[in-house]
């Protein structure tokens, strides 16, 4: 069927349109275009004879039309009058005619709109504003945008006049926004420039900052006032009702108690004619004295004396505060506060109670701190330590022993050998020792202030022969793939070589094995169950050698994925089901069973006599090792078939 398509259907003035012909018949003589919905010679635009390829203008030809051999008609420089229907008359060779009608519409290109307003300075909560989109244009649609968003739904917003007018009732400061209007028709859309609505509002109740109302004598008072307002507010200050100044800030240096009173800020908006005030009450306090601490015992003895610290001066109706090591007081039965908190008593002082201690007096504004006080706690001497830790020495070397004991004041030292006093020094030195220098070496530490003494005895053996060593371990039960173990060969001896064996073999090369501390320490990183072996250490010098007893490492591991045996999964009805679960684990795992998810027993073996098809299902064995914190499980499906119906196994 012959049809006409307009491309485009909506045409802008000045542009062009193509009336495109579809399904043109074969064997044509010619065709004619007419303005309107029917063939009318008076309204012929153009005719076309195919044989001669001759186009002949008609009465309605405007000079802007071009006809194409395929019968399509191009109209250029479109004007408003071109809107309407166009009819194509086709004359076939057999002189049978066909007609088709198409149409298009012509619209003007819209100008850029602008917004007019009936009120350039509306007052908040009082005025309404009507925005109108100019110019008024026929067949145009009007749209509005607020801050580049489409209009919000609000009972205070109303569109009228075919959406050309936007009215804001009872404007608020939040209506201060960018407004745009847009005109649209089928061929164009244009947006106006922004119009910013300037809403007059305020002043709101002013806020005075800072918020604190308590000040200390001698400080500066600096108050600032702010009230939301458009245009910005004008400010005035009043003190106790008396006008001071017309500024936003009020500054009074070096205030005294006499500056206490009520401070009023007044905000005024000349455009709205409104005033608002806020009052704050300022209190100025006299400066309190700086506190200090007195002590009833300046040199207390550890674990014997108590110390009472008192915060001075005594002031009525005052709160006293205490700090130790810049922290508030810890909860301790050895710390006691008096009823008024002014005295802090330390019962049975220790060396850790040195402080520093601070007390504070709290007034309405702040806390005044005392200078810190440090206690001189007399303590010790503790048990002295003798270094180095060697106990075996070879003849001919020098023996140099040093003694140290924690003590305040520092300890005085004495050395005794086999009970006989030697010297009053911290270090003992004997050159070129022999077997005769073997014996008991005693260091005595004395604190002259507390009168306490402590001793440590060390057995020194001077011998070419080495003792039998022993192995100490930092972890007797390491967890597999998690822990490390450090074995140390004892004792520490001078000029000695340390050796290690595992299961009677020298140490294997492994990145998990590390020797340190002069080979005296053997560390196993990330232990595995295979490390549960016999470890032996040996010591040797140029004269002798000796080996320790073996130490076996107890590695905690597992549980590994359990195995259920027998492996059969098919049983005949009437057979006994006897399932055994096993998982490698140290310590042995706790076993438990579930049948079809229901907990059963906590045994390694699950036995069910004379099973039936009702015993079909999933049999799960769960294993747990609390020492490693690990769990594991396995599920087995069991099928029980009626006797004689299955090639399955019978248990």
């Amino acid at each position: 069927k012959l049809t006409i398509e307009s491309t485009p259907f909506n045409v802008a003035e000045g542009k062009e349109v193509l009336l495109l012909v579809h399904n043109l018949p074969q064997h044509l003589f010619g065709y004619s275009w007419y303005k309107g919905e029917r063939v009318d010679g008076n309204r012929q635009i153009i005719g076309y004879v195919i044989g001669t390829q001759q186009a002949t203008p008609g009465p309605a030809y405007s000079g802007r039309e071009i006809i194409y051999p395929n019968a399509s008609l191009l109209i250029q420089n479109i004007i408003q009058n071109d809107t309407g229907f166009y009819t194509l008359h086709v004359i076939k060779s057999d002189l049978v005619n066909e007609e088709a009608t198409g149409q298009f519409r012509v619209y003007p290109e819209l100008p850029k709109p602008s917004i007019s307003s009936n009120n350039s300075k509306p007052v908040e909560d009082k005025d309404a504003v009507a925005f109108t989109c100019e110019p008024e244009t026929q067949d145009a649609t009007y749209l509005w945008w607020v801050n580049n968003q489409s209009l919000p739904v609000s009972p205070r917003l109303q569109l009228s006049n075919g959406n050309r007018t936007l009215t804001l009732f009872n404007v608020t400061r939040n209506d201060t926004a960018s407004y745009k209007c847009e005109t649209q028709n089928p061929v164009s859309a244009r947006r106006s420039d922004s119009v910013i609505l300037n809403v007059l509002y305020g002043p709101d109740a002013p806020t005075i900052s800072p918020l604190n109302t308590s000040y200390r004598s001698g400080e500066n008072l600096n108050l600032s006032c702010h009230a939301a307002s458009n245009p910005p507010a004008q400010y005035s200050w009043f003190v106790n009702g008396t006008f001071q100044q017309s500024t936003q800030e009020l500054f009074i240096p070096n205030i005294t108690v006499n500056n206490s009173g009520s401070y009023t800020c007044q905000a005024h908006n000349s455009d709205t004619g409104l005033n608002r005030t806020t009052v704050t009450t300022i209190t100025v306090y006299a400066e309190p004295p700086k506190p200090f601490i007195t002590s009833n015992n300046s040199n207390p003895v550890e674990d014997e004396d108590a110390v009472a610290l008192t915060c001075e001066p005594e002031i009525q109706n005052t709160t006293y505060l205490w700090w130790v090591n810049n922290q508030s007081l810890p909860v301790s039965p050895r710390l006691q506060l008096s009823n008024d908190n002014r005295t802090l008593t330390l019962l049975s002082v220790t060396r850790n109670d040195v402080g520093p201690y601070e007390c504070g007096i709290q007034n309405e504004l702040s806390v005044d701190h005392s200078d810190p006080v440090i206690l001189n706690v007399l303590y010790g001497p503790d048990d002295p330590t003798i270094s180095p830790s060697y106990t075996y020495y070879r003849p001919g070397v020098n023996l140099s022993l040093s003694c140290h004991a924690a003590s305040n004041p520092p300890a005085q030292y004495s050395w005794l050998i086999d009970g006989n006093i030697q010297q009053h020094t911290q270090e003992l030195f004997i050159s070129n020792i022999t077997e005769k220098n073997s014996g008991l070496y005693t260091c005595q530490a004395n604190n002259s202030a507390s009168g306490h003494s402590r001793t440590t005895v060390k057995t020194i053996t001077v011998s070419a022969e080495l003792p039998k060593p022993s192995i100490s371990s930092n972890n007797s039960k390491p967890v597999e793939d998690k822990d490390a173990v450090a074995f140390t060969c004892e004792p520490e001896a001078q000029n000695t070589t340390y050796l290690w064996w595992v299961n009677g073999q020298s140490l294997p090369v492994s990145p998990r094995l590390q020797l340190s501390n002069g080979n005296r320490t053997l560390t196993l990183f990330n232990v595995t169950r295979n490390d549960a072996r016999a470890y032996v250490c040996g010591i040797q010098n140029s004269v002798s050698a000796n080996r320790s007893d073996p130490v076996t490492l107890d590695v905690l591991y597992g549980p590994d994925t359990p195995i259920i045996s027998p492996p059969d999964s098919s049983y005949l009805s009437g057979a006994n089901l006897n399932l055994s679960c096993h998982s490698a684990s140290n310590p042995s795992p706790q076993y438990s069973w579930r049948i079809n998810g229901i907990p059963q027993q906590h045994t390694q073996v699950l036995f069910i006599a004379k099973i039936t098809p009702n015993n079909n299902g999933t049999y799960a064995c769960f294993v747990s090792n609390l020492a490693t914190g690990r769990n594991n499980s396995i599920v087995k499906s069991i099928t029980v078939s009626a006797s004689g119906t299955s090639p399955g196994l019978s248990a």
Partner: antibody, heavy 120, light 107 residues
Framework: QVQLVQSGAEVKKPGASVKVSCKAS????????LHWVRQAPGQGLEWIGY????????NYSQKFQGRVTMTRDTSTSTVYMELSSLRSEDTAVYYC?????????????WGQGTLVTVSS | DIQMTQSPSSLSASVGDRVTITCRAS??????LAWYQQKPGKVPKLLIY???NLVEGVPSRFSGSGSGTDFTLTISSLQPEDVATYYC?????????FGQGTKVEIK
Amino acid sequence: QVQLVQSGAEVKKPGASVKVSCKASGYIFTSYWLHWVRQAPGQGLEWIGYITPNTGYTNYSQKFQGRVTMTRDTSTSTVYMELSSLRSEDTAVYYCAREYGNYNYPLDYWGQGTLVTVSS
Amino acid sequence: DIQMTQSPSSLSASVGDRVTITCRASENIYGYLAWYQQKPGKVPKLLIYNAKNLVEGVPSRFSGSGSGTDFTLTISSLQPEDVATYYCQHHYGTPYTFGQGTKVEIK
């Protein structure tokens, strides 16, 4: 239901032996391990050892090693605990108790106890 | 052998009170700890195993906690029927050892 029924009270002279029985019922005898625990008058609980009924394996406390023997009879689901060389401090109530499972579990069912009095 | 130390050895509390008994092992027993209740003239009854697992049928006012060496049995609201001696026991390998017991009475 699970039950452990022990033999009756015994009075023995110092140096003698005593054999206490514990008959199990209400569960599969060979699946659970059985322990012996004693309690002297007014005192706490003291573990003696255990037996695994399926294999007859025993594990005794070092304190009773050499004096205690635990056996089992699977045909009657009974375990026995024999203590020899009795002395007065062996006077106690002797309990058999079933382990809640196998390996590192506590004791969930206890016999009613057997009072053994050692007196000259 | 692993030693088990219970505290207190006895306590007296009112009905409805929260009661706590502690048990300390001489070495790490991980979570292998059980609590028993023994009423006068009766056999011990298992309450809790693996430090915190409540045995079926035991009232929920009983609870256990802890791991390593320090463990606690808590009775959230003491009832008259809870008068008994309570024992802790480690079940980490043999020999099994028990605490010396805590006697709980009603005020």
